[in-house]
């Protein structure tokens, strides 16, 4: 049925569609939306309460250490490869994510202020 | 690109075991799930069993769970997959395949393990 | 485990024909639904992935439809290399399961 309606409202051949996404916690029914051109669809579906057990994270990923700071950006970052991934999780090979070079700095300096008023 | 290379044909008597190899070159052999499926003479796919070499958890079809064993070398990018007690029933072609959900699988070429007395 | 009845079992088209294959799952699958084409003597080799995404290599004439338990395999005008068995397959749920499989014939 759900099938039906996509294909009547829609002349659309080829729909894209998102991830399931649980309507609560992280497993069980759920939605996943579809576009094609201007037209979306809702459809209902199922994340495997059995697989998020099994495998956590979808996505999992081996970093290298921290770069040096970018006094441009005020920023560091870090290249992850994939190490394992969800069966069903379409995980980029390679990741990369930044910070601010600071926020260590910053909390470092805390602590010993901390420390010394103690 | 990945390529799977599998070992050589075998010919086995009924209620021996074989092992069959599949060596991975290219991209990262320990980031996908590989996956094992045979197909028996003139039938369809079946799956057996897939294995992570990252951490070797292994997730096994019941219906192989006391005739297949899947294992990996990290060190030499190798997957094998052994059967035990062999019957002529177990005649097929084994093939490796790695997955990964983003772009897709690559097959080894197969392995044809004929069972006969 | 998720039965995958596949129709029609054989399908007689000639080159330039569009082909229409299915794919029925016992129970909602999402979009975990695969396809793949099979020669003799080959590996198989993955056409569609998750119901409906294409694949690198794969030509523009193969597309799939999903999701839910009724899925599609077009060829939009066959080739004669297109004559060979397709398998669909799910990743649903444990174990994965393939389709009894459409074999593409000449007419």
């Known amino acids: 049925k759900k099938k039906e309606k996509v294909k009547k409202g829609s002349e659309c051949s080829e729909w894209t569609w998102g991830p399931c996404t649980p309507s609560s916690k992280d497993c069980g029914m759920g939605f996943r939306e579809g576009t094609c051109g201007a037209q979306t669809q809702r459809v209902h579906c199922k994340v495997p309460c059995n697989w998020k057990k099994e495998f956590g994270a979808d996505c999992k990923y081996k970093f290298e250490s921290w770069g040096a700071c970018d006094g441009s950006t005020g920023t560091k970052a870090r290249q992850g490869t994939l190490k394992k991934a969800r069966y069903n999780a379409q995980c980029q090979e390679t990741i990369r994510v930044t910070k601010p070079c600071t926020s260590k700095t910053k909390s470092k300096t805390k602590a010993k202020k901390g420390k010394g008023k103690d | 690109q990945v390529q799977l290379v599998q070992s050589g044909a075998e010919v086995k008597k009924p209620g021996a075991s074989v092992k069959v190899s599949c060596k991975a070159s290219g991209q990262s052999f320990s980031s996908y799930w590989m996956n094992w499926v045979r197909q028996a003479p003139g039938q369809g796919l079946e799956w057996i069993g897939m294995i992570h070499p990252s951490d070797s958890e292994t997730i096994l079809n019941q219906k192989f769970k006391d005739k297949a064993t899947l294992t990996v070398d990290i060190s030499t990018s190798t997957a094998y997959m052994e059967l035990s007690s062999l019957r002529s029933e177990d005649t097929a072609v084994y093939y490796c395949s790695s997955w990964s959900a983003k772009r897709g699988d690559f097959w080894g070429q197969g392995t044809l393990v004929t069972v006969s007395s | 485990e998720i039965v995958l009845t596949q129709s029609p079992a054989t399908l007689s088209l000639s080159p330039g024909e569009r082909a229409n294959l299915s794919c029925r799952a016992s129970?909602?699958?999402?979009?975990?639904l695969h396809w793949y084409q099979q020669k003799p003597h080959q590996a198989p080799r993955l056409l569609i992935k998750y119901a409906s995404q294409s694949i690198s290599g794969i030509p523009a004439r193969f597309s799939g439809s999903g999701p839910g338990t009724d899925f599609n395999l077009t060829i939009s005008s066959v080739e004669p290399e297109d004559f060979a068995v397709y398998y669909c397959q799910q990743s649903n749920s444990w174990p994965l399961t393939f389709g009894g499989g459409t074999k593409l014939e000449i007419k």
């Open positions: 129970e909602s699958i999402s979009n975990n």
